[in-house]
């Protein structure tokens, strides 16, 4: 029995609903009474949702899953996962048996966009050319871990003296703090780019130091 799922991971934003697609080819004369369908976590075989003996056996996964009952008879065994969480990320196996059996695994990739970075400066007053300052770029509640890039006003990457830390909160979302230590010139703009590698989403922050006053666009 051939069971088909998408090759590419399904990408879902935290808090939204995701559909894990799975299909099989019913033989002529197939009835739902014959169908045994199991969705499970691939690694542990933990039951997620099942259908057997013509009946939806329900969700075993925090009551956040559902099948598409009207489509099962046509071979659509897809699973709807509601209110996606970071902890849902991973591989799900769709197992179908009628008289024969087959299975296939689909990957769920969870993502959350990072907030627009906030920029802070230390020290933040009485700055003169030649002073060493610490610029901190902070962006919140993203997933997965971000890539952080710094550059100056001419677009030249700044890679030295950068320290980036990422901490997961209780929901598994990351807060990013990147610190750039730089010696001030006469004036300058310093930009921080926080990139979500899954969403290919960039969040920008910058600070311009012009002597007095400083601006934070």
């Amino acid at each position: 029995l051939e069971v088909q799922v998408p090759e590419d991971p399904v990408v879902a934003l935290v808090g939204t609903d995701a559909t894990l697609c799975c299909s099989f080819s019913p033989e002529p004369g197939f009835s739902l009474a014959q169908l045994n369908l199991i969705w499970q976590l691939t690694d542990t075989k933990q039951l997620v949702h099942s259908f057997a003996e013509g009946q939806d056996q329900g969700s075993a996964y925090a009551n956040r899953t559902a099948l598409f009952p009207d489509l099962l008879a046509q071979g659509n065994a897809s699973l709807r996962l509601q209110r996606v969480r970071v902890a849902d990320e991973g591989s799900f196996t769709c197992f179908v048996s009628i008289r024969d059996f087959g299975s296939a695994a689909v990957s769920l990739q969870v993502a959350a966009p990072y907030s627009k970075p906030s920029m802070t400066l230390e020290p933040n007053k009485d700055l003169r050319p030649g002073d060493t300052v610490t610029i901190t770029c902070s962006s919140y509640r993203g997933y997965p871990e971000a890539e952080v890039f710094w550059q100056d006003g001419q677009g030249v990457p700044l890679t030295g003296n950068v320290t980036t830390s990422q901490m997961a909160n209780e929901q598994g979302l990351f807060d990013v703090h990147s610190v750039l230590r730089v010696v001030l010139g006469a004036n300058g703009t310093y930009s921080c780019l926080v990139r979500n590698p899954v969403l290919q989403q960039d969040a920008h922050g910058s600070v311009t130091i012009t002597g007095q006053p400083m601006t934070f666009p």
């Epitope: 039951l47 075993a60 197992f95 024969d100």
Partner: antibody
Framework: EVQLFQSGGGLVQPGGSLRLSCAAS????????MSWVRQAPGKGLEWVSA????????YYADSVKGRFTISRDNSKNTLYLQMNSLRAEDTAVYYC??????????WGQGTTVTVSS | DIQLTQSPSSLSASVGDRVTITCRAS??????LNWYRQQPGKAPKLLIY???SLQSGVPSRFSGSGSGTDFTLTISSLQPEDFATYFC??????????FGQGTKVDIK
Amino acid sequence: EVQLFQSGGGLVQPGGSLRLSCAASGFTFSSYAMSWVRQAPGKGLEWVSAISGSGGSTYYADSVKGRFTISRDNSKNTLYLQMNSLRAEDTAVYYCARGVGRGFDYWGQGTTVTVSS
Amino acid sequence: DIQLTQSPSSLSASVGDRVTITCRASQSISIYLNWYRQQPGKAPKLLIYAASSLQSGVPSRFSGSGSGTDFTLTISSLQPEDFATYFCQQTYSTPPWTFGQGTKVDIK
């Protein structure tokens, strides 16, 4: 009438090989998953191996993985179990069986495999 | 792998008795639990599939119940041919499709 007729059992020395056959009739063989189950003397049932209808998916118990090979010839309506590197603990009655999610609804009559020097 | 534990491992009963055998799975298997009777020297025979569905041709004195991890086979009135060994089996998802260790029912 569904029938599964087994053959190929016998006495074999440790390290030897044997091939079991299970000839099916009375149903569309290629539409059904098939399994081998064994029962050591005085012991319980042990699932050994399974194969999908097309033969494209095969599974094995850890105890036989790498030594046994399940296969099928849908043109001959026949299921096979090739057993290599046989050990004394493989001594058992071997059954072929049809089915999966709704259980194994038809079984062969069983064939005895004895591994002894 | 999913383990199945049957209890009791053996029991003695008389014709006409009501007999109950339990099977516990090491993790949730929904209703993918089957019951077999094996008489001495014979192949196993499917009695119950999907926890509670009676296999065609099996007498109605056999019934099954349960879901998740706990399952029960009940024989409402034991007959002479029921003195045999009973096995539970899970067919949850991809193999291995393991069996319980068996329950032998003999004459009291």
